[in-house]
Every structure is written in structure tokens, then in C-alpha cells.
């Protein structure tokens, strides 16, 4: 899939985590079909 | 040790395109995106866009959005940006930079220059 | 999309100096600034990363700090190899953002 500029992050949020996609892992593939 | 390696410069004519490779080795190429970025001559440095080597999901900077291509082939750990419709402000050099989640972009490659030129 | 003002734009220092680079956010990016070193005809080098972590191998006189929208980086004592372009750039959204670069010349 493509996104244009991603999903941004909500600085509001308690989550001090980044908005980037984290490091690829194999279970993110995408199930065939 | 990490290593991304691309492809050398090329010349090319306004309203052509333009295909860069990047090479990766020294760590596992599907377990960090890749990223591209480009500086032209005398300027700062802008993102273009990335990709996920196992799902090939993209993010893109607006600006590139209708015109870049971002592909990979993990079976030789490659990495390519397609730059289509040139124009001579496309001149720059091109980057593949690997990200990693916590530290952002941790490598990057020597760059590939582009010059767009009729 | 997040704008990143960083200031001065031009530096002139000498060896041995400290010096300071500001770089700020038009909205909090929590603490998601790195900060990279560019020298002529180079790629860019990463330095610092999450606002104030030191990438490895980077030399402990570049410091990183702030958070929410203000960010330094500051270097406790020039030396000769440190003189370069610096830029900041944010990672804590979509789009990845880049300062407008700082070039530290030598006085």
C-alpha cells in the first residue's frame, strides 16, 4: 500500500512513542491473497 | 559492518526518467526500511519517501508522490527509486539511507548524482 | 506537515570554541530530533538521534538536548574535523522533516 505522507502522531497523546512505522518483522507480511 | 552501495551517476534529458539502485549489506535488508532523500547542488536535504522491504508498503513526500517509484528485491538486498517526468530542478544527488525505528537514519549510502540537462 | 527553523544559519568559530545550534519545531515532536553532520561531497553522518542520545561512535563532545519544539546541539570544543554542515531533522511523523542546515566555518 502507499501513503503520501503516513499517519502523523497525535502530540497530545500520553504515548511518547514515535508515529513512524516501527522496523519491519516478518509478522507484518501481508497474507496472500 | 553496514553498508549501502548505489549506483553511478547518471545524465539524462528533461521529461526522461531515472532509475537508482542501493546495495545493502552487513545486516538483515528486510528488517529496516529504506529510505530515500536528495540534496540539490548548494541546498539542504529532502525527503523523499520510503518502503518496507517485506510488505513494499510506501510512504511518500507529497511532492514526489505522482512521480517516484520505490521498489526493492530482497532476494539480492536492493533497494531502487524511479524518478520519471524530469526537469532540470531534479538535478541533485541522491541518498538511500537505512531507518531504524529508534535512531532514524543510521546509514546511508555514497549518493548517486543526477544530472538533468537537455 | 512539522517545520524546522534552525538557527544560526551560518556559524564562524575557532578550534576550541563551544558552540550551540538551535534547532525548533513549528509543533511538539516529543523527543524525536537527530541531528546530522555533512561535510563536502559526503553523506551525511548521523550524530545524535531521540533528542540527546549519542550515535555510536560519535565523539562525547556533541551533546544533544531539548524536547516538545526547542532542540541544541551544542559542541563542547571545536576540532579542525568538526567543521561541516549540521542539520536536524525530525523523526517523530510522517513527513520526515529536515532542517535548513547550519554551516560552521572557521573563524
Known amino acids: 500500500s502507499e501513503t503520501t505522507t503516513g499517519t502523523s502522531s497525535n502530540s497530545s497523546q500520553s504515548t511518547s512513542n514515535s508515529g513512524l512505522a516501527p522496523n519491519p518483522t516478518n509478522a507484518t507480511t501481508k497474507a496472500a491473497g | 559492518q553496514v553498508q549501502l552501495v548505489q549506483s553511478g551517476a547518471e545524465v539524462k534529458k528533461p521529461g526522461a526518467s531515472v532509475k537508482v539502485s542501493c546495495k545493502a549489506s552487513g545486516y538483515d535488508f528486510t528488517g529496516y526500511h529504506m529510505n530515500w532523500v536528495r540534496q540539490a547542488p548548494g541546498q539542504g536535504l529532502e525527503w523523499m519517501g520510503e518502503?518496507?522491504?517485506?510488505?513494499?508498503?510506501?510512504y511518500f513526500n507529497q511532492k514526489f508522490k505522482s512521480r517516484v517509484t520505490m521498489t526493492r528485491d530482497t532476494s539480492i538486498s536492493t533497494a531502487y527509486m524511479e524518478l520519471s517526468r524530469l526537469r532540470s530542478d531534479d538535478t541533485a544527488v541522491y541518498y538511500c539511507?537505512?531507518?531504524?525505528?529508534?535512531?532514524?537514519?543510521?546509514?546511508w549510502g555514497q549518493g548517486t548524482t543526477v544530472t538533468v540537462s537537455s | 506537515d512539522i517545520q524546522l527553523t534552525q538557527s544560526p544559519s551560518f556559524l564562524s568559530a575557532s578550534v576550541g570554541d563551544r558552540v550551540t545550534i538551535t534547532c525548533r519545531a513549528s509543533k511538539s515532536i516529543s523527543k524525536y530530533l537527530a541531528w546530522y553532520q555533512q561535510k563536502p561531497g559526503k553523506a551525511p553522518k548521523l550524530l545524535i538521534y531521540a533528542g540527546s542520545t549519542l550515535h555510536s561512535g560519535i565523539p562525547s563532545r556533541f551533546r544533544g538536548s531539548g524536547s516538545g519544539t526547542e532542540f541544541t546541539l551544542t559542541i563542547s570544543s571545536l576540532q579542525p574535523e568538526d567543521f561541516a554542515t549540521y542539520y536536524c531533522q525530525q523523526h517523530n511523523e510522517y513527513p520526515i522533516i529536515f532542517g535548513q542546515g547550519t554551516k560552521l566555518e572557521i573563524k
Open positions: 539511507a537505512r531507518r531504524d525505528y529508534g535512531t532514524s537514519l543510521d546509514y
Open positions: 518502503i518496507n522491504p517485506i510488505t513494499s508498503d510506501k
